[in-house]
Interface confidence: medium
């Protein structure tokens, strides 16, 4: 049986970014027809992960896993009946709590982003890492880069692979 | 608001193992009163991740995230009413699909383990990585090591931190 996943292409891109392997990221982005400016924007985010070392990738992977499997994420999907849920509702749509986090990572202030992460994982080392990554992204990315990253996310969320 | 997570101590241990940082792993294991033989068993698993490099940790992190956020995991928890779910059922218990995967990783054959991973993430590179890790664990761990790892998992699943 092949199980449905919550927006698999999103997680493919996230882990390719956090991994620091440009080739893996390119393969994932090709699947959603990313433009050159969108690729550049994602690679700038990728550079922040790789520059801050393995621990940064692991801690942020932990945050992503925690949010994705949190009651908040699961709870949001359970506005429908159990049968509905089993059929379709939750199957492939990305959880709103994950979306919120990604949006704040790009468009929020460092404090807003760290505050959202703290709702899910309050370990000081995790929060410090979140702030470092956010500061790096703000230093590296222009407003145009951030708009391109957001437009790529729209492509991901609306992709048949999500 | 501090959200409930699905068995946070389990994910802390998983990411500490996959990270290859002995200190982080020791800190996590101390929280569940791990014995010396249990620690040794977990460090043997950790060695397999470290030996297979960054890509191994990233791909296995992707598998864990995918299973944890899959319809299979979420669906299993939704046998109760929505209200029940929001209160308690899903809050902190580890998803049975994750448990199954971990059990097969330790006690199954490589084929059984890879087949279970394939239900969630069928990318060839992911499946090849799963087989490499499984073969490594089988080569490194004695039967006694595996029993110790399973007893540690029981401690994790029944811990107040789960």
């Amino acid at each position: 049986v092949k199980m449905a996943e919550t927006c698999p292409i999103f997680y493919d891109v996230f882990f390719a970014v956090a991994n620091g392997n440009e080739l893996l990221l390119d393969l994932s982005l090709t699947k959603v027809n990313a433009t050159e400016p969108e690729r550049t924007a994602m690679k700038k985010i990728q550079d922040c992960y790789v520059e801050n070392g393995l621990i940064s990738r692991v801690l942020d992977g932990l945050v992503m896993t925690t949010i994705s499997s949190s009651k908040d994420c699961m709870g949001e999907a359970v506005q429908n009946t159990v049968e509905d849920l089993k059929l379709n509702t939750l199957g492939r749509e990305i959880c709103p709590a994950v979306k919120r986090g990604v949006d704040l990572f790009l468009t929020g202030t460092p404090d807003e982003y760290v505050e959202q992460v703290a709702q899910y994982k309050a370990l000081p080392v995790v929060l410090e890492n979140a702030r470092i990554l956010k500061n790096c992204v703000d230093a590296k990315m222009t407003e145009e880069d951030k708009e391109n990253a957001l437009s790529l996310l729209d492509k991901i969320y609306t992709s048949p692979l999500c | 608001v501090k959200m409930a997570e699905t068995c946070p101590i389990f994910y802390d241990v998983f990411f500490a193992v996959a990270n290859g940082n002995e200190l982080l792993l020791d800190l996590s294991l101390t929280k569940v009163n791990a014995t010396e033989p249990e620690r040794t068993a977990m460090k043997k698993i950790q060695d397999c991740y470290v030996e297979n490099g960054l890509i191994s940790r990233v791909l296995d992190g992707l598998v864990m995230t995918t299973i944890s956020s899959s319809k299979d995991c979420m669906g299993e928890a939704v046998q109760n009413t929505v209200e029940d779910l929001k209160l308690n059922t899903l809050g902190r218990e580890i998803c049975p699909a994750v448990k199954r995967g971990v059990d097969l990783f330790l006690t199954g054959t490589p084929d059984e383990y890879v087949e279970q991973v394939a239900q969630y993430k069928a990318l060839p590179v992911v499946l090849e990585n799963a087989r490499i890790l499984k073969n490594c664990v089988d080569a490194k761990m004695t039967e006694e090591d595996k029993e110790n790892a399973l007893s540690l998992l029981d401690k994790i699943y029944t811990s107040p931190l789960c």
Epitope: N19, G20, N21, E22, L23, D26, R39, T40, K43, K44, Q46, D47, C48, V50, E51, N52, G53, L54, I55, S56, E128, N129, R131, I132, N135, C136, A139, K140 | L54
Partner: antibody, heavy 120, light 106 residues
């Protein structure tokens, strides 16, 4: 073994241009991020630019932004630095340096450097 | 831009003595801090990566510690060949070097 050899340095007038090259050998060049770092005579190290393994992302220090361009040719195992609108304060030894794979350590191997002198 | 400040600027030490060099970042950089040694007329060499990880082939007398904003390079039992300038580099957000610390032998 890892080897990085810079070339292209020399004397140039203010406002002039120069192109530095770095020939890499002993490793799979296309897997690694690469940097240019400089050191003015008797002074400390200054990072000026780096480029991702595939060449699609580049970064610059504010002091050279808009004047210098980093690029690479993975087929030729070569890294380049195009320097335009040169100033006296750009006089320095220019080093190319490799990052560890997946950026696991910045500047794990360096070349011997090439001297650029900007003077009228 | 993240600014790194090293101290001291200069240190004169007798052989077998312990040397401590500090590097302070203007904002938290986690463990993304690296140490280099540069001897006269040579290119720099990586000693310590990510605050505390020894680079391959580096003698065990060199060690690093710290995280966040405060970092330390320690040379236990200085040898004559350790006379050099030592630099810290942050890689958390782009890259910047400290101004350097010159160590010479008394």
């Amino acid at each position: 073994q890892v080897q990085l050899v810079e070339s292209g340095g020399g004397l140039v007038k203010p406002g002039g241009s120069l192109r530095l090259s770095c020939a890499a050998s002993g490793f799979t060049f296309s897997d690694y991020y690469m940097n240019w770092i400089r050191q003015a005579p008797g002074k400390g190290l200054e990072w000026i630019s780096y480029i991702s393994s595939g060449g699609s992302t580049t970064y610059y220090a504010d002091s050279v932004k808009g004047r210098f361009t980093i690029s690479r040719d993975n087929a030729k195992n070569s890294l380049y630095l195009q320097m335009n609108s040169l100033r006296a304060e750009d006089t320095a030894v220019y080093y190319c340096a490799r990052d560890g794979k997946y950026n696991t350590s910045p500047g794990d191997y360096w070349g011997q450097g090439t001297l650029v002198t900007v003077s009228s | 831009e993240i600014v790194l400040t090293q101290s001291p600027d200069f240190q004169s030490v007798t052989p077998k003595e312990k040397v401590t060099i500090t590097c302070r970042a203007s904002q938290s950089i986690g463990s993304s801090l690296h140490w280099y040694q540069q001897k006269p007329d040579q290119s720099p060499k990586l000693l310590i990566k990510y605050a505390s990880q020894s680079f391959s082939g580096v003698p065990s007398r060199f060690s690093g510690s710290g995280s966040g904003t405060d970092f330390t390079l320690t040379i236990n039992s200085l040898e004559a060949e350790d006379a050099a300038t030592y630099y810290c580099l942050q890689s958390s957000s782009l890259r910047t070097f400290g101004q350097g610390t010159k160590v010479d032998i008394k």
